[in-house]
């Protein structure tokens, strides 16, 4: 799997999309996980609805939400109020039993907001009750890592 880079601006929302073969993955739940180190496990952040027929319902864990268009074959993850600590390697997964197939490897990069000259105390933090649907979504810049690019920096 190549790694796709999604860039978002700090404090804004970033939308990550993972296309997949809807027939091949028919009936399967999906998940978004964070890669812990080059050889480490992928730690589950959020997964789609327990009832596959309800996969279109948005599931949320903190500032991350997931929804699955199982007919169109697109898994969408929204990272709201993007912070520097959100940067890193992730995976979109298709679950079957205790196994997980990788749909896409993702590198999330968080860019400083060039227009933000406010004090840190003035930063906008969305309310708990604010809808993900209403959140402004930064149209993410995405690209694939070039061959030979190292997805994880070598450990000293």
């Amino acid at each position: 799997h190549n790694t796709t880079v999604f860039q978002g601006v700090e404090g804004q929302s970033l939308q990550v999309s993972c296309p997949y073969d809807s027939m091949k993955h028919w009936g399967r739940r999906k998940a978004w996980c964070r890669q812990l180190g080059e050889k480490g496990p992928c730690q589950r952040v959020v997964s789609t609805h327990n009832l596959w027929l309800l996969s279109f319902l948005r599931r949320r864990n903190g500032s991350t939400a997931i929804t699955d268009d199982t007919l169109g074959g697109t898994l969408t993850i929204t990272l709201r109020n993007l912070q520097p600590h959100d940067a890193g390697f992730y995976q979109c997964q298709s679950l079957h039993g205790s196994e997980a197939d990788t749909l896409r490897k993702v590198l999330v990069e968080v860019l400083a907001d060039p227009l933000d000259h406010r004090d840190a105390g003035d930063l906008w933090v969305p309310g708990e009750s604010e809808s993900f649907e209403d959140a402004h979504v930064e149209h993410s810049i995405s690209r694939s890592l070039l061959e030979g690019e190292i997805p994880f920096p070598p450990t000293s």
């Epitope: 327990n50 009832l51 596959w52 027929l53 309800l54 319902l57 948005r58 599931r59 007919l71 649907e133």
Partner: antibody, heavy 118, light 107 residues
Framework: QVQLVQSGAEVKKPGSSVKVSCKAS????????ISWVRQAPGQGLEWMGG????????NYAQKFQGRVTITADESTSTAYMELSSLRSEDTAVYYC???????????WGQGTMVTVSS | EIVLTQSPATLSLSPGERATLSCRAS??????LAWFQQKPGQAPRLLIY???NRATGIPARFSGSGSGTDFTLTISSLEPEDFAVYYC?????????FGGGTKVEIK
């Protein structure tokens, strides 16, 4: 602002059928599930079934299987719930509800009272 | 089917008091639990989804907690408009089911 507007109250004879409509305004009708929930007088809420976008067809609670038919007309953004072989215990307020984001029941219609009486 | 048992059936409290409503599932529903408020002659209104997340526009005095089989809806300080019937609902298993309701009435 999304709204669901239901048809008016009905009085029906036992053994007959009733068809309740639910018109949606705002949003993309086909991308959301429309569910039907009923509430007998002084009682709790009971999920009957709904049109789920993924399945493209309706899913029903076992209790109502064979007696309820849920359909939708995308051209008019209207969902319908038809209940047949009515009996007195079907006397209830019937609600339609729509997904917005997180649950099948984010947005509700105003309810339609159906009275079954001889 | 999963049975949701709500307790108490009726809660008599005064404005300003704290209300604690319970919903117990007959088997685990993970965090797939929502809370609704219903006033006489009105349709239900979504308050809480995924056990602990407030729906859009719901005041901060409403909070939900719990996971698995035991869930709680807390209203930190009752306002006059909070006196109503409250229902829990699960969608972890088919069929989707609702609890029998808790009526919060003015003492």
């Amino acid at each position: 602002q999304v709204q669901l507007v239901q048809s008016g109250a009905e009085v029906k004879k036992p053994g007959s059928s009733v068809k309740v409509s639910c018109k949606a305004s705002g949003g993309t009708f086909s991308s959301y599930a429309i569910s039907w929930v009923r509430q007998a007088p002084g009682q709790g809420l009971e999920w009957m079934g709904g049109i789920i976008p993924i399945s493209g067809t309706a899913n029903y609670a076992q209790k109502f299987q064979g007696r309820v038919t849920i359909t939708a007309d995308e051209s008019t953004s209207t969902a319908y719930m038809e209940l047949s072989s009515l009996r007195s215990e079907d006397t209830a307020v019937y609600y339609c509800a729509r997904t917005q984001e997180y649950t099948l029941f984010d947005i509700w219609g105003q309810g339609t009272m159906v009275t079954v009486s001889s | 089917e999963i049975v949701l048992t709500q307790s108490p059936a009726t809660l008599s409290l005064s404005p300003g008091e704290r209300a604690t409503l319970s919903c117990r599932a007959s088997q685990s529903v993970s965090s797939y639990l929502a809370w609704f408020q219903q006033k006489p002659g009105q349709a239900p209104r979504l308050l809480i989804y995924d056990a602990s997340n407030r729906a859009t526009g719901i005041p901060a005095r409403f909070s939900g907690s719990g996971s698995g089989t035991d869930f709680t809806l807390t209203i930190s300080s009752l306002e006059p408009e909070d006196f109503a019937v409250y229902y829990c609902q699960q969608d972890f298993h088919w069929p989707i089911t609702f609890g029998g309701g808790t009526k919060v009435e003015i003492k």
